[in-house]
Interface confidence: low
């Protein structure tokens, strides 16, 4: 903690200005009034404070606002945002996208993924849902940040907003997040023609169920291997060799490259070797010819 001292009269601060860069830590602590600092936060970022001096300023704001900073202060944090922890940010109530933009710009190039994720979460909570303006802001200022939201938060995305999401915004999304987003995307793009629909739905397919993947295989879509590899294992396993060949089109050759990786490996193990051989790719590991396949799960369900 910063040592408490009395402010020398000649060091009294009436304005937040450049003169403060010459103050030692204890002088800043003693001489800067927290309310003045909060009122003139917009000036802080124009002054080249050291990280140590910023620590002092943060400490003063924490004392003034123990329940969390007001948005008028948050908006003008500037580089002081780099000093915030996720725990600090969790106390905030943020509704303005201008605030979000300002802080996303500051965080660029710094290792702040946890803080940014928490900030976005607070914005979604503050605004009540993940609306189009918020999504537009995230895609413009923080590609990939959409995936930092929990599935619960993503569930507040209205289908009408899905069109604003770009493929690169979903690169880091996990299966649980795509499980939430895929049905919304399906709804959002349902009136599009086949090829246009596939282009739009492709980034979301990691959340698609088997029946939808099977349906796509009948539509001449030529799914690329990268997309196929991101499909849910459970969605891929029931597909037949013919369905996979139709689904991938010219990219079916890539199965050879990926034969050791899930979900391709798991899918191969469930196919008859005879069927795999029809692909002409030399895929190995299928069920040998003449073997009888017993689905024990069905038998257990019956007993």
């Amino acid at each position: 903690d910063v040592e408490r001292t009395t402010c020398p009269p000649e060091k009294e601060v009436h304005e937040i200005d450049e003169s403060l860069i010459f103050y030692k830590k204890r002088e800043l602590e003693a001489c800067v009034d927290a309310a003045l600092l909060a009122a003139q936060m917009d000036r802080v970022d124009a002054i080249p404070f050291t990280y140590e001096q910023l620590d002092v300023l943060k400490h003063k704001l924490d004392e003034l606002y123990p329940q969390g900073y007001p948005e008028s202060v948050i908006r003008h944090l500037g580089h002081l945002f780099l000093k915030m922890s996720p725990e600090d940010i969790r106390k905030w109530n943020v509704t303005s996208l201008e605030t979000l933009k300002a802080l996303l710009k500051v965080s660029k190039g710094h290792e702040m993924s946890a803080q940014v994720a928490t900030l976005i979460d607070r914005v979604v909570v503050g605004r009540g849902q993940l609306d189009k303006d918020t999504v537009d802001t995230l895609t413009a200022f923080c590609p990939g940040c959409l995936c930092s939201l929990s599935p619960e938060r993503l569930s507040s995305v209205p289908p009408s907003v899905i069109g604003a999401v770009r493929p690169q915004d979903l690169d880091t999304c996990g299966p649980r997040q795509l499980d939430v987003l895929y049905p919304k995307a399906r709804l959002a793009f349902q009136n599009m023609s086949g090829s246009e629909y596939f282009v739009k739905i492709r980034p979301f397919l990691g959340g698609a169920p088997t029946e939808d993947v099977k349906a796509l295989s009948q539509q001449n879509v030529s799914m690329d291997l990268a997309t196929f590899m991101k499909l849910r294992r459970e969605a891929v396993l029931p597909l037949t060799v013919a369905e996979v060949q139709k689904l991938l089109g010219p990219h079916v050759e890539g199965l050879k490259v990926e034969e050791q990786h899930s979900p391709v490996r798991d899918w191969i193990l469930k196919q008859r070797q005879d069927d795999l051989d029809t692909l002409g790719l030399g895929l190995q590991g299928g069920i040998p010819n003449g073997y009888l396949i017993l689905d024990l799960s069905v038998r257990e369900a019956l007993s």
């Epitope: 690329d224 079916v252 490259v257 029809t278 002409g280 030399g282």
Partner: antibody, heavy 117, light 113 residues
Framework: EVQLVQSGAEVKKPGASVKVSCKAS????????MHWVRQAPGQGLEWMGN????????YYNERFMSRVTMTVDKSTSTAYMELSSLRSEDTAVYYC??????????WGQGTLVTVSS | DIVMTQSPDSLAVSLGERATINCKSS????????????LAWYQQKPGQSPKLLIY???TRESGVPDRFSGSGSGTDFTLTISSLQAEDVAVYYC?????????FGGGTKVEIK
């Protein structure tokens, strides 16, 4: 040893068609895709398309879609590439190449096709 | 289509010296799931067919001398010949095998200085 032996050089007039053959040996013909790549004189390589010898399915580069046909004869382990409506800019060496995955692991010796009036 | 850009167009290197060829793709060639980069390098000697050197950006084809190595990820790739030999005089091509149509770089001619 894998070998791809292509047919000899051809001279064609503009508007005509050419059919280049590629006889494969030293491996199971139906287990690997066959690609066709061309190279104009002094130029780089251009992928034309590929064919699955097992099913006969072929996929063409859109640039050639309306003019190219790729076929196979499994009984002789031979792949064919036919290019129609020839023009002078089709003068090139045409290669068949067997895939190793998605890359081109083995290449034929090339067939020079000259289009000239 | 994915555009492949090679540099330099030509390169003159002394025997025994290192030769470096760059290849840039207009889209990532990295499959984020398998972490494979779908890029191959070929060597074409004068009057001959191309020959596969490297696939998956860095996996050397069997029989290729270990002075040839590939590196890079995403959109930027490099082929390095650590100690140039007289028999390495050729044109070198990169090729993406990630999306059809598979496309090649324009080629880099390597000569002896």
């Amino acid at each position: 040893e894998v070998q791809l032996v292509q047919s000899g050089a051809e001279v064609k007039k503009p508007g005509a068609s050419v059919k280049v053959s590629c006889k494969a040996s030293g491996y199971t013909f139906t287990n690997y895709w066959m690609h066709w790549v061309r190279q104009a004189p002094g130029q780089g390589l251009e992928w034309m398309g590929n064919i699955n010898p097992s099913s006969g399915d072929s996929y063409y580069n859109e640039r050639f879609m309306s003019r190219v046909t790729m076929t196979v004869d499994k009984s002789t382990s031979t792949a064919y590439m036919e290019l129609s409506s020839l023009r002078s800019e089709d003068t090139a060496v045409y290669y068949c190449a067997r895939s190793g995955g998605l890359w081109l692991a083995f290449w034929g010796q090339g067939t020079l096709v000259t289009v000239s009036s | 289509d994915i555009v492949m850009t090679q540099s330099p167009d030509s390169l003159a290197v002394s025997l025994g010296e290192r030769a470096t060829i760059n290849c840039k793709s207009s889209q990532t060639l990295l499959n984020s799931v398998s972490q494979n980069n779908y890029l191959a390098w070929y060597q074409q000697k004068p009057g001959q067919s191309p020959k596969l050197l490297i696939y998956f950006a860095s996996t050397r084809e069997s029989g290729v001398p270990d002075r040839f190595s590939g590196s890079g990820s995403g959109t930027d790739f490099t082929l390095t010949i650590s100690s140039l030999q007289a028999e390495d005089v050729a044109v070198y091509y990169c090729q993406q095998h990630y999306r059809t149509p598979y496309t090649f770089g324009g080629g880099t001619k390597v000569e002896i200085k």
